[in-house]
Amino acid sequence: PGPPPGPPRVSPDPRAELDSTVLLTRSLLADTRQLAAQLRDKFPADGDHNLDSLPTLAMSAGALGALQLPGVLTRLRADLLSYLRHVQWLRRAGGSSLKTLEPELGTLQARLDRLLRRLQLLMSRLALPQPPPDPPAPPLAPPSSAWGGIRAAHAILGGLHLTLDWAVRGLLLLKTRL
């Protein structure tokens, strides 16, 4: 006979797992909020800015009560992957004006990446079905001008801020239900 089986793997407490994900999300929300304020100070926004390639906001007012954990985590992961791609694009193609937001944009990218890894881990720990690998996204066109890069930055940081606020709300509520 083969070697004796090891001790059974203790399943981590899902509430504790979710709790640390909430805290990481709140931490990223704080970073995003600070960076968006910094951007507004340097380059005041004239109204709302949109970018067609950004994900649409995952929810509206009435939807919180109906949230289920698998749906929230899957949607959040997909949206954050899109924002990660947009932040990478912004750092690469955003133009010299946005260089003034470094190293903060780099830090934001690293923390976004960390949260995505955390979500992946949480989904596997909770034995949630893993989403299929994302199809390669079409490359993002470089901004048409320096001002286009700044408008894109407003849209990306504003959208990420709302997505993270929504995520914190959803995750906090789901944690109370576990």
Epitope: D19, S20, L23, L24, R26, S27, L29, A30, R33, L57, M59, S60, A61, G62, A63, L64, L162, D165, W166, V168, R169, L172, L173, K175, T176
Partner: antibody, heavy 119, light 111 residues
Framework: EVQLVQSGAEVKKPGASVKISCKAS????????MDWVKQAPGQRLEWIGD????????IYNQKFTGRATLTVDKSASTAYMELSSLRSEDTAVYYC????????????WGQGTTVTVSS | DIVLTQSPASLALSPGERATLSCRAS??????????IHWYQQKPGQAPRLLIY???NLESGVPARFSGSGSGTDFTLTISSLEEEDFATYYC?????????FGQGTKLEIK
């Protein structure tokens, strides 16, 4: 000057509802969430809930779920809290306060609205 | 819910003296590089006013005689030299989790 101005005092009968308004000025209304806090006589402050003015999506203290309803009118930079099925224990001062979910402290407060529930 | 216990319930001191107010949480409120404790001052008939956020950060416009410290479950608000206008009730609040809760308050009175 950043300000939150609340509606006036209310006297209600048990079982009735009350709706309090909170008008924000001096900052971009959608840049912060709006929280509501209860202060009953001789009791500690109690958080009721929080709403994001851009997406709505309120979250509530479980103690108030089902009785408190938070809404906003973005165009008027005004937040509302409605409390239904009033009872004597709801007699309190209710505050709106500016907050955000990242750190969740309240840096600007309304002046408070006194709600008295009495038959 | 996390319970915050403030001590003492009341404190009588004279202007110029140092005040030390305590807030103890029923579980740790420090994590991910933050201590999620905030301090407020409230005077009779007025709304609370934020003094300190995230345990030790002084809110804009608050005099430097106010300071906050602590981590984990034990936090302190210190007023280095009391002024007449500091006599009020002080509350701590945590924001570590849903729902945020407040301590029962410490009333600072003139001796």
């Amino acid at each position: 000057e950043v300000q939150l101005v609340q509606s006036g005092a209310e006297v209600k009968k048990p079982g009735a509802s009350v709706k309090i308004s909170c008008k924000a000025s001096g900052y971009t209304f959608t840049d912060y969430n709006m929280d509501w806090v209860k202060q009953a006589p001789g009791q500690r402050l109690e958080w009721i809930g929080d709403i994001n003015p851009t997406i709505g999506a309120p979250i509530y203290n479980q103690k108030f779920t089902g009785r408190a309803t938070l809404t906003v009118d973005k165009s008027a930079s005004t937040a509302y809290m409605e409390l239904s099925s009033l009872r004597s224990e709801d007699t309190a001062v209710y505050y709106c306060a500016r907050g955000e979910l990242a750190h969740w402290y309240f840096d600007v407060w309304g002046q408070g609205t006194t709600v008295t529930v009495s038959s | 819910d996390i319970v915050l216990t403030q001590s003492p319930a009341s404190l009588a001191l004279s202007p110029g003296e140092r005040a030390t107010l305590s807030c103890r949480a029923s579980k740790s409120v420090s994590t991910e590089g933050y201590s999620y404790i905030h301090w407020y001052q409230q005077k009779p008939g007025q709304a609370p006013r934020l003094l300190i956020y995230l345990a030790s950060n002084l809110e804009s416009g608050v005099p430097a005689r106010f300071s906050g410290s602590g981590s984990g479950t034990d936090f302190t608000l210190t007023i280095s030299s009391l002024e007449e206008e500091d006599f009020a009730t002080y509350y701590c609040q945590h924001s570590r989790d849903l729902p945020p809760t407040f301590g029962q308050g410490t009333k600072l009175e003139i001796k």
